[in-house]
């Protein structure tokens, strides 16, 4: 089902407006901000979620990098331009005509420029490293149990096939989750690793995007896993293009 028929809500995206005006009176949901129809049986794209977040009333508001080309989302929130499929447009601009190129997860990958800036293609983020530090516990978590629970979580809650969870590393108190998904691997219907990572990030921060479900209650063999810090690194299929000035800053 595309949405919860009984009360016409979107289980996977609470930042939607839903009404029974779809074919045959079916519940249809549209993302806030963009008005685009969303498939409520799967995750909504990060671009549409960011756009919805920027349109909503404002409320109070990252170990070693995997490579020198890893990106961290230092720019924070912005109101993105999304394409008709809900993906980020390769070029993003703000109201003051400052433009920049982004990757498939919407993170800036070039210096900022003006309206003449060209972004030829949307470069895919194929490797995401989620770096977590958990709160002190009586003892370390069992690595195998932790690996299994995180894979289960990504499969069941975020609908990400475990084949895209390349590895789970653990050196107490640091947990690293590696998500990998090459263009050739991603089949129609597969959740994008960028979307799964964004939902996970919001869950970890206590800002769940799910409608009517409780927040994330992460447990490993019954022991609560409480995260106190999150850093996410993004690696693109083509390295980013920043000036030396930025790299040495």
């Amino acid at each position: 089902h595309t949405a919860a028929q009984d009360n016409c809500t979107c289980p996977t995206n609470k930042m939607t407006v839903c009404s029974p005006d779809g074919p045959g009176g079916r519940c249809q949901c549209r993302a806030l901000g963009s008005g685009m129809a969303v498939d409520c049986s799967t995750l909504t794209s990060k671009c549409l979620l960011l756009k919805a977040r920027m349109s909503a009333p404002k409320n109070a508001r990252t170990l070693v990098r995997p490579s020198e080309h890893a990106l961290v989302d230092n720019d924070g929130l912005y109101d993105p331009d999304c394409d008709p499929e809900g993906r980020f447009k390769a070029r993003q601009c703000n109201q003051t005509s400052v433009c920049w190129c982004v990757n498939s997860v919407g993170v800036r990958r070039t210096d900022k420029g003006d309206l003449s800036l060209r972004c030829d293609e949307l470069v895919r983020t194929h490797h995401i490293l989620i770096d977590l530090r958990h709160r002190p516990t009586a003892g370390a978590f069992n690595h195998s149990d932790l690996d299994a629970e995180l894979r289960r979580l990504f499969r069941e809650r975020y609908r990400l096939h475990p084949k895209f969870v390349a590895a789970v590393h653990y050196e107490q108190p640091t947990i690293q989750i590696e998500l990998r998904q090459n263009t050739s691997q991603k089949a129609a219907g597969d959740v994008d690793i960028g979307d799964a990572a964004y939902y996970f990030e919001r869950d970890i921060k206590g800002e769940s995007l799910f409608q009517g479900r409780g927040g994330l209650d992460l447990r490993v063999r019954g022991e609560p896993l409480q995260v106190e810090r999150t850093l996410i690194y993004y690696l693109d299929e083509i390295p980013p293009k920043f000036s030396m000035k930025r790299l040495t800053a």
């Epitope: 089902h1 289960r152 084949k163």
Partner: antibody, heavy 119, light 111 residues
Framework: QVQLVQSGAEVKKPGSSVKVSCKAS????????INWVRQAPGQGLEWMGV????????SYNQKFKGRVTITADESTSTAYMELSSLRSEDTAVYYC????????????WGQGTLVTVSS | DIVMTQSPDSLAVSLGERATINCRVS??????????MHWYQQKPGQPPKLLIY???NLESGVPDRFSGSGSGTDFTLTISSLQAEDVAVYYC?????????FGQGTKLEIK
């Protein structure tokens, strides 16, 4: 302990439908998807489909598309598999099986339900 | 669909001897070093039982005489010292992509 308990054997006429239930206990039902697998007499195992107990939707083996419907009732921790337009070659033992934690392996299985299709 | 081919179809091994079952897959089931290949044991009148997951990981409670190896497209289940209770049909299964598929089974008997 984790248990999957299935409904009893059924005898059905060709062209009719059958609905097999699988009641789960010993774990949080919505934490693990449930698969259905069948085994014809003296034959191997054949995956039919899987339901996300968290979302309530299913994906199916194309071979059965249009004939099989997998549902779940969170309130009773029960999954169901309905197969329609039955034919004699659908005579088989039908199993429900839970996904394991990490790699989509099937770690717990129901005891099986024999469905016999005969005129 | 991914095709799984087990060999041999049947196998007779003496008690205490080594039994080896092979499974060849039509395309790789490896993803970043994780092989989505599992082995099950099925005894008459019973449901299958998970023995090995991710090609080589022993499921909890399974005797350590069972082991799995291989990667990509070629996998092996080994029973190091056959016991009487190991008489069963053994199946390999891939969960890399749906439809998830099983091998045709290998019947293991005592010689």
């Amino acid at each position: 302990q984790v248990q999957l308990v299935q409904s009893g054997a059924e005898v059905k006429k060709p062209g009719s439908s059958v609905k097999v239930s699988c009641k789960a206990s010993g774990y949080t039902f919505t934490d693990y998807s449930i698969n259905w697998v069948r085994q014809a007499p003296g034959q191997g195992l054949e995956w039919m489909g899987v339901i996300s107990t968290y979302y309530g939707d299913a994906s199916y083996n194309q071979k059965f598309k249009g004939r099989v419907t997998i549902t779940a009732d969170e309130s009773t921790s029960t999954a169901y598999m309905e197969l329609s337009s039955l034919r004699s070659e659908d005579t088989a033992v039908y199993y429900c099986a839970r996904y394991g934690d990490g790699y989509n392996q099937f770690d717990y299985w129901g005891q099986g339900t024999l469905v016999t299709v005969s005129s | 669909d991914i095709v799984m081919t087990q060999s041999p179809d049947s196998l007779a091994v003496s008690l205490g001897e080594r039994a080896t079952i092979n499974c060849r897959v039509s395309e790789s089931v490896d993803s970043y070093g994780n092989n989505f290949m599992h082995w099950y044991q099925q005894k008459p009148g019973q449901p299958p039982k998970l023995l090995i997951y991710r090609a080589s990981n022993l499921e909890s409670g399974v005797p350590d005489r069972f082991s799995g190896s291989g990667s990509g497209t070629d996998f092996t289940l080994t029973i190091s010292s056959l016991q009487a209770e190991d008489v069963a049909v053994y199946y390999c299964q891939q969960s890399y992509e749906d439809p998830y598929t099983f091998g045709q089974g290998t019947k293991l008997e005592i010689k």
